[in-house]
Amino acid sequence: EPTMYGEILSPNYPQAYPSEVEKSWDIEVPEGYGIHLYFTHLDIELSENCAYDSVQIISGDTEEGRLCGQRSSNNPHSPIVEEFQVPYNKLQVIFKSDFSNEERFTGFAAYYVATDINECTDFVDVPCSHFCNNFIGGYFCSCPPEYFLHDDMKNCGVNCSGDVFTALIGEIASPNYPKPYPENSRCEYQIRLEKGFQVVVTLRREDFDVEAADSAGNCLDSLVFVAGDRQFGPYCGHGFPGPLNIETKSNALDIIFQTDLTGQKKGWKLRYHGDPMPCPKEDTPNSVWEPAKAKYVFRDVVQITCLDGFEVVEGRVGATSFYSTCQSNGKWSNSKLKCQPVDCGIPESIENGKVEDPESTLFGSVIHYTCEEPYYYMENGGGGEYHCAGNGSWVNEVLGPELPKCVPVCGVPREPFEEKQRIIGGSDADIKNFPWQVFFDNPWAGGALINEYWVLTAAHVVEGNREPTMYVGSTSVQTSRLAKSKMLTPEHVFIHPGWKLLEVPEGRTNFDNDIALVRLKDPVKMGPTVSPICLPGTSSDYNLMDGDLGLISGWGRTEKRDRAVRLKAARLPVAPLRKCKEVKVEKPTADAEAYVFTPNMICAGGEKGMDSCKGDSGGAFAVQDPNDKTKFYAAGLVSWGPQCGTYGLYTRVKNYVDWIMKTMQENSTPRED
């Protein structure tokens, strides 16, 4: 328990102290007091540095004194031979004696008293930052006006925190600026602007004077700016050392000014303003920005338009432009949207042709369409090369987005016809010599394939059967062979409007306009045994001259049989119409004069008995194309004749080309168009 005073005596005092003794006294006075220790008697064996016997006075870790020998008072009115004063409330006294004493020593006598200390003056470290006030047993600190005492009850500071600045422009300065700023203070200022604006701080070098850094470069007083996770500073020294313009990229800024106890300077002054948050001018490939500006800021909107051949895709749909807004966080909206190459997709397949699998279907890629040669060719030209265009379509230089059309090659037999033996002046033939040859089984007749959907024949063949069964691709018309060949199903029969329909067709004498078209339900697939014959051109090159040779083919009557099972063919010349008129009709159904001969008929034959006959009707009279020797065209159709083995009459197809084209056009499907 602390006491205000007390006495300390060496062992056995005033008798001689014993050898080999060590004794200590812990003196404690109340808090706020120091200790005054007075020695009134001292008689201890003398030795160098008091090594043998001694009394030691210790304060904390400090030895205040070590005594030995004899002392007497210098003042006849005072018994005090030695005194010690410490500004602390604790003191330790230690007495030690060694193993022998050469004489008899009586030791020491001492007393202590608690004395008031002046905390304000007695210590090297001043306890108060500003005003120190001493009283008996303690002290208290106080502050000048406008300062307040911190919770530690020692330090004074300025109440400079808590200000929040929300205006878009403002000025902030250290306390008392330009007078010296307060020591030992922490000033915090907050700038809080509307989202979308960044705080920009502006300082002038001469508006900044803060206590300089220590030798280690640490600021003793410091100014720091904190914006989100970014910090600017600490700054100190004479003249602002940082950038004079600080773009914080944030709408919130904390300014922290920290000062220590010493070295006050004039401080600092700054201006701030809110700048609309900038957004970076991003490099967005394959696009253009509108409007183009050097700097974009909060609320700016740009239209980003993809270059030709590029688009923004979302799911299965795309757009060529989009809008992007500079947002309050300094980032662009829609930054995920990228202009990517247009994808034209897998190219459409075409009938009777193919397109190779493209390596790429993106903008600029090239594909090639080809037709199934040698049976089909590209009717609408363009060469079959298409590139992926900017609008997402496969485009050809000639046709644009229109797909190539593979149409059958006409008039080219896979194998040329060569006469062998005579059968009504004709020879055996193979269907490959006449791939256009169509077989009608009721009535037994012929026809000519002119494209995928149409068969040309004689009107008299179909006038009695508007739903004829037809076959293509077979040399033999035996039932077993026909079962394996391609049967054609008619959709509609179109008889020329100039063909006169009779109640008793057997008595017919007028075969003018003996021509008909059969529209097929399904397209015919072309190949080596099935391909169409060409139609004549409209120019004078296709006007037949007497002596021009043509080929006829069919399964009609021969010298030996009423019907042929295998295909027969013959080459015959064109003859003047009078040659046909001169031949006597074999089984006339009327007067010879009643038979009608018109310019719509071709007369041919009369050479080596080669002729068409019953059962060949509707088959083509095929003539070599004058403009392309590799092709045959249907110059005529087997129509009628006065007598088999002489001359025959053929419908002059050239006179009906317009009707044929018009009929086909008016009755085609959209796919054919």
Epitope: R299, V301, Q303, E314, A319, F322, Y323, N334, L337
Partner: antibody, heavy 116, light 107 residues
């Protein structure tokens, strides 16, 4: 196929918070923006905000600023919307939606009822 | 914020009718406008994007037009399944705002 499946209905007291989840399948949320839209009973649609799950950037409508937090967990392909300090007028169906160019896919909606 | 105003608020029509809904923006939104259809108890469905582009799978009777501040959604021949509420939405700038909706009812 693309699907957004939201968590179930919630009943909350005024002042409480609610967190609604939106689990995406058929696409990676990092490649899209995830939006939240709400619809009070017999009312129209109200856009609340969005997140870019790739970098966690968010934008909120001013009305909800400070009360709404949109987050995303790319490991589970899920977006979340948390609304705090609930009041009775926050009773609504909350939808998540995915966008690049437009809101092509929507969740089925989550009814949040705020009642004392 | 950009305000979107739809008119009319509601309208009655019959199957086969031609119907027009308009949407006005308080400031220029160029063509950054989408139209959505919502049926009771269902999530909204996208019909038209970028003012005039029909979203995939949307019937051709739906069409959109306009740019700047005035936009139109047209249904050329109303079908029974078209009775619903229609919303316009601007995606020109955040916040992305919706119109208040137009309820299309059977007459």
């Amino acid at each position: 196929q693309v699907q957004l499946v939201q968590s179930g209905a919630e009943v909350k007291k005024p002042g409480a918070s609610v967190k609604v989840s939106c689990k995406a399948s058929g696409f990676n949320i990092k490649e899209y923006y995830m939006h939240w839209v709400r619809q009070a009973p017999e009312q129209g649609l109200e856009w609340m905000g969005w997140i870019d799950p790739e970098n966690a950037d968010t934008i909120y409508a001013q009305k909800f600023q400070g009360r709404v937090t949109i987050t995303a967990d790319t490991s589970t392909n899920t977006a979340y919307m948390e609304l705090s300090s609930l009041r009775s007028e926050d009773t609504a169906v909350y939808y998540c939606a995915r966008s690049r160019l437009f809101f092509a896919y929507w969740g089925q909606g989550t009814l949040v009822t705020v009642s004392s | 914020d950009i305000q979107m105003t739809q008119s009319p608020k509601s309208l009655s029509a019959s199957v086969g009718d031609r119907v027009t809904i308009t949407c006005r923006a308080s400031q220029d939104v160029r063509t950054a406008l989408d139209w959505y259809q919502q049926k009771p108890g269902q999530s909204p469905k996208l019909l038209i994007y970028s003012a005039s582009y029909r979203y995939s799978g949307v019937p051709s009777r739906f069409s959109g037009s306009g740019s700047g501040t005035d936009f139109t959604l047209t249904i050329s021949s109303l079908q029974p399944e078209d009775f619903a509420t229609y919303y316009c939405q601007q995606q020109y700038t955040t916040p992305y705002t919706f119109g208040q909706g137009t309820k299309l009812e059977i007459k």
